[in-house]
């Protein structure tokens, strides 16, 4: 039998690609190419990715799997999903923390660190938007507190306390007791 090269693979199914001498069926996700097929339209020898490595896509050429990423503890990252043979570790922030991107044009693969979310309650403010992808958005002061400078100040508990205009507007009803 002779061998001639054709620019495309005339094999049943569409997952064949030329690897060396022959058109070969590739390796499924989670497997690497140990050896190409040894005959036209044959199956390549594929092996499962070793522990702590992965390949996310079907492939014809990867002779080794990619190393799983380790979440950056220094940046307070945690693993949201552990690495598997077909998917890399998914790193993120633990509950109560949010992602702060380290570059201006932020995409999913950009480096990031985790910041603790603002606790609106501790600031005596309403929580307007819960913290997830960005920091908590705090609203107006909680009942019994009034805006003073950048913070919320507790209404005075007696008439002895000085009560400026904004205080009076919020806490005025308390002066009657």
């Amino acid at each position: 039998q002779g061998g001639t090269r054709s620019p495309r693979c005339d094999c049943a199914g569409d997952f064949h690609k030329k690897i060396g001498l022959f058109c070969c069926r590739g390796c499924p996700a989670g497997h690497y190419l140990k050896a190409p097929c040894t005959e036209p339209c044959g199956n390549s020898t594929c092996l499962v990715c070793p522990q702590d490595t992965f390949l996310a896509w079907e492939n014809h050429h990867n002779s080794e799997c990619a190393r799983c990423q380790a979440c950056d503890e220094q940046a307070s990252q945690v693993a949201l999903e552990n690495c598997s043979a077909v998917a890399d570790t998914r790193c993120g922030c633990k509950p109560g923390w949010f992602v702060e991107c380290q570059v201006s044009q932020c995409v999913s693969s950009s480096p990031f660190y985790c910041q603790p979310c603002l606790d609106c309650g501790a600031l005596h403010r309403h929580t307007r938007l819960l913290c997830s992808r960005r920091d908590t958005d705090c609203g107006t002061c909680l009942p019994g507190f009034y805006e003073h400078g950048d913070g919320c100040v507790s209404c005075p508990t007696s008439t002895l306390g000085s009560c400026p205009e904004r205080c009076a507007a919020v806490c005025g009803w308390r002066q009657m007791f």
Epitope: G3, R5, I19, G20, L21, A35, P36, T38, P40
Partner: antibody
């Protein structure tokens, strides 16, 4: 460790026959295509023949087509080259080699001398 | 058949020199090219596959590049143990063909 060991070489008269063997170890022989490659004294390398992992597909250089037959026995981890109607120009060291895209492992070779 | 034209056929260089060998295919072989080293009385040894992939255990002073029809093999700093004959080989199309070899000597 991958090992390929050729045997069966020797001197033969023109028109004679020889059968070369290649014993493989250290890898899953039945997963790999195998080839015979030769080198005439003081010359370069010349591919001779190829056989698929199952033995179902065989290929030959024009210079040996119809005279040489490649075969394999996966149960015995062995590759063979039956050489008939030998000519003086077939004199060479014959290597068996494992196909892994390129030829990543070679035997030490066996010398075939065709002379009257 | 694809003809592999290797040059030079021989070359002499000093230890520490940068050495370059070229290989030209008579038709496009994408990157299905390998380079072998053969020392006298020994079997060839695969150094590079797929034009540029260094085999495991091969010193990093060896490298390969190119695609299509033109390929280059380089030794960045020649060592005494590199004295050998070097062959390119295409495995894009049967019959498999080799270059005629480059004999490397130390000055």
């Amino acid at each position: 460790e991958v090992q390929l060991v050729e045997s069966g070489g020797g001197s033969v008269q023109p028109g004679g026959s020889l059968r070369l063997s290649c014993a493989a170890s250290g890898f899953t022989f039945s997963s790999y295509g195998m080839s015979w490659i030769r080198q005439a004294p003081g010359k370069g390398l010349e591919w001779v023949s190829y056989i698929s992992s199952s033995g179902g597909h065989t290929y030959y250089a024009d210079s040996v087509k119809g005279r040489f037959t490649i075969s394999r026995d996966n149960a015995k981890n062995s590759l063979y080259l039956q050489m008939n109607s030998l000519r003086a120009e077939d004199t060479a060291v014959y290597y068996c080699a494992r196909y892994s895209g390129a030829f990543d492992h070679w035997g030490q070779g066996t010398l075939v001398t065709v002379s009257s | 058949d694809i003809v592999m034209t290797q040059s030079p056929s021989s070359l002499s260089a000093s230890v520490g020199d940068r050495v370059t060998i070229t290989c030209q295919a008579s038709q496009d072989i994408t990157n299905y090219l390998s380079w072998y080293q053969q020392k006298p009385g020994k079997a060839p040894k695969l150094l590079i596959n797929d034009a540029s992939n260094l085999e495991t255990g091969v010193p990093s002073r060896f490298s390969g590049s190119g695609s299509g029809t033109d390929f280059t093999f380089t030794i960045s700093s020649l060592q005494p143990e590199d004295i050998a004959t070097y062959y390119c080989q295409q495995y894009d199309t049967l019959p498999i063909t080799f270059g005629q070899g480059t004999r490397l000597e130390i000055k």
